[in-house]
Structures are given as structure tokens and as C-alpha cells.
């Protein structure tokens, strides 16, 4: 690694993340018709335009906003599952479920899935050894800008009813600093959206308790409510009929359709 | 289209046993949660008992518990209970339902239920 | 466990709209089951996830929950309509609860 190269304190770039960014928007536009005009090339274009040569500091929702545009796509408004620190779970639940979406059932959010990048202030480098941690270095990263910007925006094209699925194992089920608590929660428009709907999972098999009364869900119930949408809180104790769709996603226990 | 037949039931006297079995036909029976339910004459519907697909999670009402136990086998794809030590006020029709998918934890299908009658 | 409360009775005349109440502690924070029982014959799902209609189901029968109560309304109630009806919800691991079960009488 050259000297002068900034050390950042996480991971760096993924490897082949370039063809792999390539190769997934592929595959996503093959699959979902409505994408097929989409110029990948083009996607990925825009993709690199937003951070390459950038000091990965100094990123902007601005610097993606070519991507954005390359990447607008209509999903079904009142169809929405949001989520906080259940990401598996609330995959294989649109897995099966496929008449609801998540972000990363959505292009843009598809292509950038468990990946990470940063490029380099005034090269067209792509920086594989290190990038920014969001805590220890700084949020304007490349990866954090561009998780922020389409939370907001699909937290924006939401109505009716929205769903978020929750970790009930977790010490803070509602977690204001998570994107869920700090993004998506504050752009959901109150003149779409008439209600949330949590879905808070359970993960012990003896476990009987009522999450829904937990202080954080509380403080979700509150900060709802005071932009005017209604606030709707399920406990859902068996998340083991998520997994077995898996195994079987075409078997007819993987629809909520009676 | 989904069935549940359920057999088994008949006159015991108390502190006795009998087994149910369920036959289930027209979906995959590896797939659902199953349980029975029971409604002794005249009176309302009691959830007797729970099994999950893989048979790792069992779950059992405070009244039967320890004299009953829920099996199943995916093979044949049949649903048990097995009955013991039981009592004059276990009588009732036993049904045998299927859970529905998903995020919801209810009774989409059921078996025309089996008469189980406690009595000497 | 929760414990679920039903009207042992409830009596409409034909055409008119009948409301069954289900009432429990924070029964909104759980999604609540309707079924309709004939004498003689099997339970039948007419609600699930306290506002869903199975397919088959017709649409004069909805469901609503919030705060502690659940309501199953039936509109334009029919005489085929009179039957027993049973609440339920599942409150984690052996919590599976039936409310009393409610008689409509269509007059």
C-alpha cells in the first residue's frame, strides 16, 4: 500500500466491485420487466460518478443523484416492508411474499446490498484496503450517503398501510439512531401514509411476552403519531415459518393469500 | 383441495388412553404448524396443542399437559395425540387444524373432529 | 394469558348489521381470528389477521382491532348468518386463546 494512501478505520471496497455492481444490475433488470430499459452500463456510470475522485468524506445525496435518476422505479406504494436489524428475515419474508418489497428488492437497493466502497480525493482510484467508518471516521462516506438518500426516497413513495419489521431480540427493538429510526420513520408523508404497522419478532420459543409495550416501541408509537400517521404494533412469535418458506418458496404456505 | 380427517376417538374409561391421528391430503403437511382443538358438549373451543413442521418446537395447554403428547409424522403425513391418564372432563370432539402461514397464527382448515368420550 | 371476553348473545334482525365484541389487555398488540360454527359441524375461518377475508368468505364479514377490543361486523346480515362465533389470538409459545364464543340469532 502506498504511503500517502488515507487509512480509514473499515473495511474497504469489496473486491470486484465494479463487475459485481455490473453483474447484478444484469441480472435485476433480466428479471424484473419493467426494468428492462435500464442501461447497466450506464448504472454503473453514474454509480462510479458519484464517488470516484471524491474525498470520501465529502460525499453528498447530490453526488448520486445521477444514479437516482437511472434508477427510478415504482413499486407498489401501499406494499412497503421496512425494516431495522432483522435484514435476513424480512428478505425471506419478500422472498415469499412477493407482493411486498423491501429496499433491497427495489434496483438501486439490489445492486449496493451488503457491499461496500469508497474511492480516493483527486484520483480514479477505487480504495480496496480501507474506508470510512461511519462512527470512528465520518457519516458523509460514500456507503452511508447512498443508503440514506434511497431510505429517504422509498420512505417517501410509501402510503397506505407500511409495515417495518423489527428484532425483538434485540435491547432496542425501535433503535432511533438505525436508518428505520433516524431516515425512513421522519419521510414517511402523513398525507400517503394513514398507518405503521410494526411487526415485532420474537425470537425465544417459550417467549410470551408483549413487546409491543416496550419502551422503545413506545417512543416509536410517540414520534408517529406526532406526524400524524397512525401507529399499529403486532407481536409475531414464530419467525420459523419464514425459514421453512425458504426451503420451499413455491409451497402454499408462503402466502399470506387464505 | 385441503382435507383433514380425523380418527381414533371413542368410549375409554377414566385414567385410560387413546390415540388420534389426523390424515392430511391436498397440501404439503411438512410445510404447516398443526394442532389440535376441542370443544366438549355444548360448550366453546379449547386449543389443546401445537407442533411445528420440523417437530422441534411442541407447545401444550396447562389442562393436558403432561398426559397428553402431539406428534407427527411428515412421511405419512399424519398428525398424533396420544391421550393418557385421561379424565371425565377431557370429553369433547377433537379436531385437528391447520395453522395458517406466515406472520398469522390462526386455524385456516379443519377436520370434521373425532367424539372422545371419558367416561365408566 | 390474555383472556378473551365475548357477548354470550347477540341478536340481529335480517338486513341489519351485527357487531360481536372480542376483548382482551392490549389485544391490539396481537392479531386477532373469527370463526363461525354451525351446530354439528366444524369451525370456519371468517377473519384472520384481524381485518382479512379468506377467499370464499363473503364480503358483508370484516373485522377490526384496536385497543383492547376486536369487532367482528357483519352487514346486511343474512339468516344463513346465525351461528356461534369464536374469537382467538396466539400470545406466544402454549398462548393460544378462544374467547367464549358468541350466539347471533337473526331474528
Known amino acids: 500500500v502506498p504511503r500517502w494512501r488515507q487509512q480509514w478505520s473499515g473495511p474497504g471496497t469489496t473486491k470486484r466491485f465494479p463487475e459485481t455492481v455490473l453483474a447484478r444490475c444484469v441480472k435485476y433488470t433480466e428479471i424484473h420487466p419493467e426494468m428492462r430499459h435500464v442501461d447497466c452500463q450506464s448504472v454503473w456510470d453514474a454509480f462510479k460518478g458519484a464517488f470516484i475522485s471524491k474525498h470520501p468524506c465529502n460525499i453528498t445525496e447530490e453526488d448520486y443523484q445521477p444514479l437516482m435518476k437511472l434508477g427510478t422505479q415504482t413499486v407498489p406504494c401501499n406494499k412497503i416492508l421496512l425494516w431495522s436489524r432483522i435484514k435476513d428475515l424480512a428478505h425471506q419474508f419478500t422472498q415469499v411474499q412477493r407482493d411486498m418489497f423491501t429496499l433491497e428488492d427495489t434496483l438501486l437497493g439490489y445492486l449496493a446490498d451488503d457491499l461496500t466502497w469508497c474511492g480516493e480525493f483527486n484520483t480514479s482510484k477505487i480504495n480496496y484496503q480501507s474506508c470510512p467508518d461511519w462512527r470512528k471516521d465520518c457519516s458523509n462516506n460514500p456507503v452511508s450517503v447512498f443508503w440514506k438518500t434511497v431510505s429517504r426516497r422509498f420512505a417517501e413513495a410509501a402510503c397506505d398501510v407500511v409495515h417495518v419489521m423489527l428484532n425483538g431480540s434485540r435491547s432496542k427493538i425501535f433503535d432511533k439512531n438505525s436508518t428505520f429510526g433516524s431516515v425512513e420513520v421522519h419521510n414517511l408523508q402523513p398525507e400517503k401514509v394513514q398507518t405503521l404497522e410494526a411487526w415485532v419478532i420474537h425470537g425465544g420459543r417459550e417467549d410470551s411476552r408483549d413487546l409491543c409495550q416496550d419502551p422503545t416501541i413506545k417512543e416509536l408509537e410517540s414520534i408517529i403519531s406526532k406526524r400524524n400517521i397512525q401507529f399499529s404494533c403486532k407481536n409475531i412469535y414464530r419467525p420459523d415459518k419464514f425459514l421453512q418458506c425458504v426451503k420451499n418458496p413455491e409451497d402454499s404456505s408462503c402466502t399470506s393469500e387464505i | 383441495q385441503v382435507q383433514l380427517v380425523e380418527s381414533g376417538g371413542g368410549l375409554v374409561q377414566p385414567g385410560g388412553s387413546l390415540r388420534l391421528s389426523c390424515a392430511a391430503s391436498?397440501?404439503?403437511?411438512?410445510?404447516?404448524?398443526m394442532n389440535w382443538v376441542r370443544q366438549a358438549p355444548g360448550k366453546g373451543l379449547e386449543w389443546v396443542s401445537g407442533i411445528n413442521m420440523e417437530s422441534t418446537r411442541i407447545y401444550y395447554a396447562d389442562s393436558v399437559k403432561g398426559r397428553f403428547t402431539i406428534s407427527r409424522d411428515n412421511s405419512k403425513n399424519t398428525l398424533y395425540l396420544q391421550m393418557n391418564s385421561l379424565r371425565a372432563e377431557d370429553t369433547a370432539v377433537y379436531y385437528c387444524?391447520?395453522?395458517?402461514?406466515?406472520?398469522?397464527?390462526?386455524?385456516?382448515?379443519w377436520g370434521q373432529g373425532t367424539l372422545v368420550t371419558v367416561s365408566s | 394469558d390474555i383472556e378473551l371476553t365475548q357477548p354470550p348473545s347477540v341478536s340481529v334482525a335480517p338486513g341489519q348489521t351485527a357487531r360481536i365484541s372480542c376483548s382482551g389487555d392490549n389485544l391490539r398488540h396481537y392479531y386477532v381470528y373469527w370463526y363461525q360454527q354451525k351446530p354439528g359441524q366444524a369451525p370456519v375461518l371468517v377473519i384472520y389477521g384481524d381485518s382479512k377475508r379468506p377467499s370464499g368468505i363473503p364480503e358483508r364479514f370484516s373485522g377490526s382491532n384496536s385497543g383492547n377490543t376486536a369487532t367482528l361486523t357483519i352487514s346486511g346480515t343474512q339468516a344463513e348468518d346465525e351461528a356461534d362465533y369464536y374469537c382467538q389470538t396466539y400470545t406466544g409459545g402454549a398462548s393460544l386463546v378462544f374467547g367464549g364464543g358468541t350466539k347471533l340469532t337473526v331474528l
Open positions: 391436498g397440501f404439503t403437511f411438512s410445510s404447516y404448524y
Open positions: 387444524a391447520r395453522d395458517l402461514p406466515l406472520v398469522y397464527t390462526g386455524f385456516a382448515y
